[in-house]
């Protein structure tokens, strides 16, 4: 790994809690200033493996709202606009980090949590099992 | 919004920092215990809009390693295995939260940061602009 010298201006930390508990500033810095959040907003409809977006809300989580994709069809949309079952629509999944209030209902104490979310769908060739 | 009564066992917080700075336990709780992380690992190759995965490493960020998808083709793979430029391969992007060390090089002080990552690619019908 890369060793980085510690900044002498870092906040103090007690050994018993370090590095398990850290301080986090919730003023989010958004590095996406040059990106248009709507740039991919219509892909869910234009895709050959279209998907619906479902709102998942949990007040004990930060962010409290996450949008989950679910593929609309088992197959993929062909050039005629029909579902072609020789191909499969599958969700593209990603593990993301969220903050979970711990203890529950605490406004300023969290634990990192890893969750799996479906971001969208893609069209894949099915795995065919041949029978002898 | 949903109002949740505060847990009396919450850690104390000073008003001047609250709720901007919070405590976070970095012992990650993984809610994906029943899921197989390899379940979608071959979609990047089997997709009609295949992608390559690129490692993005930043020791000042948590997680320090993020995998970025880049579509292999402008078009999509057709039934013959050729690239069809009547369709477009496009990245599916998602905004995710990461922790950025702040001040830099501090092991126990972070700021939340929102970044846009490409998770995979999907095949879409192009938007055709007709000229009068």
């Amino acid at each position: 790994g890369i060793t980085i010298p510690r900044n002498p201006g870092c906040p103090n930390s007690e050994d018993k809690n370090f590095p398990r508990t850290v301080m986090v500033n919730l003023n989010i810095h958004n590095r996406n200033t040059n990106t248009n959040p709507k740039r991919s907003s219509d892909y869910y409809n234009r895709s050959t493996s279209p998907w619906n977006l479902h709102r998942n809300e949990d007040p004990e989580r930060y962010p409290s709202v996450i949008w989950e994709a679910k593929c609309r069809h088992l197959g993929c949309i062909n050039a005629d606009g029909n579902v072609d079952y020789h191909m499969n629509s599958v969700p593209i999944q990603q593990e993301i980090l969220v903050l979970r209030r711990e203890p529950p209902h605490c406004p300023n104490s969290f634990r990192l949590e890893k969750i799996l979310v479906s971001v969208g769908c893609t069209c894949v060739t099915p795995i065919v099992h041949h029978v002898a | 919004g949903i109002t949740i009564p505060r847990n009396p066992g919450c850690p104390n917080s000073e008003d001047k920092n609250f709720p901007r700075t919070v405590m976070v336990n970095l012992n990650i709780h993984n809610r994906n215990t029943n899921t197989n992380p390899k379940r979608s690992s071959d979609y990047y190759n089997r997709s009609t809009s295949p992608w390559n995965l690129h490692r993005n490493e930043d020791p000042e960020r948590y997680p320090s390693v993020i995998w970025e998808a880049k579509c292999r083709h402008l078009g999509c793979i057709n039934a013959d295995g050729n690239v069809d430029y009547h369709m477009n391969s496009v990245p599916i992007q998602q905004e995710i939260l990461v922790l950025r060390r702040e001040p830099p090089h501090c092991p126990n002080s972070f700021r939340l940061e929102k970044i846009l990552v490409s998770v995979g690619c999907t095949c879409v019908t192009p938007i055709v602009h007709h000229v009068a």
Partner: antibody, heavy 122, light 107 residues
Framework: EVQLLESGGGLVQPGGSLRLSCAAS????????MVWVRQAPGKGLEWVSG????????YYADSVKGRFTISRDNSKNTLYLQMNSLRAEDTAVYYC???????????????WGQGTLVTVSS | SGGLTQPPSVSVSPGQTASVTCSGD??????ASWYQQKPGQSPVLVIF???KRPSGIPERFSGSNSGNTATLTISGTQAVDEADYYC??????????FGGGTKVTVL
């Protein structure tokens, strides 16, 4: 009115064969995926096989793969299930059902036949 | 293919709410359907796409699906709702998967 009517069930000895038919009416048959689902006496539902519109793509449960063949005749609005090398554990009511979808996504099995009983016994 | 797990039975008093659960690996990332089957009859679709009701299905039937669990809720349960209920989704091989079924008894 959508109707699915199964036929062809009956008593057969282990190792024997049967051909089930499902006559569809009340809707345009050809675009839809059609499926066979079975239910052993006192047991739950088990997906057996599916066939997609043109008939080019077929899928089977592991328990019947290599023994059962699903097919369809779109000109006759009829779905078939050819069952060979039958076993006692294939004893069940066999249902024909339609997998419906629209632009919002798949709606699963919206219409079912009344079922036909297949008994495999010596 | 991953299976779907349902409780074998659920009992409810008339007018009360019955909840039938269905659990499976990452079930919330797929669509779930629910079927009602009364003795000697064919199954009937009561919920599709997690929470939608086909025409003709009473409003007391509702559904949800997130995480690893889909839930069928019958509010203001009536004697006519006594039946077996099956959840269903699809695996990645385009095969339908059914839960083992739950017998809902109205006391």
């Amino acid at each position: 009115e959508v109707q699915l009517l199964e036929s062809g069930g009956g008593l057969v000895q282990p190792g024997g064969s049967l051909r089930l038919s499902c006559a569809a009416s009340g809707f345009t048959f050809s675009p839809y995926m059609m499926v066979w689902v079975r239910q052993a006496p006192g047991k739950g539902l088990e997906w057996v096989s599916g066939i997609y519109s043109s008939g080019g793509a077929t899928y089977y449960a592991d328990s019947v793969k290599g023994r059962f063949t699903i097919s369809r005749d779109n000109s006759k609005n009829t779905l078939y299930l050819q069952m060979n090398s039958l076993r006692a554990e294939d004893t069940a009511v066999y249902y024909c059902t339609r997998h419906y979808y629209d632009s919002s996504g798949y709606l699963s099995f919206d219409y079912w036949g009344q079922g036909t009983l297949v008994t495999v016994s010596s | 293919s991953g299976g779907l797990t349902q409780p074998p039975s659920v009992s409810v008093s008339p007018g009360q709410t019955a909840s039938v659960t269905c659990s499976g690996d990452a079930l919330g990332q797929k669509y779930a359907s629910w079927y009602q089957q009364k003795p000697g009859q064919s199954p009937v679709l009561v919920i599709f796409q997690d929470s939608k009701r086909p025409s003709g299905i009473p409003e007391r039937f509702s559904g949800s699906n997130s995480g690893n669990t889909a839930t069928l809720t019958i509010s203001g349960t009536q004697a006519v709702d006594e039946a077996d209920y099956y959840c269903q989704t699809w695996d990645s091989s385009t095969r339908a998967v059914f839960g083992g079924g739950t017998k809902v008894t109205v006391l």
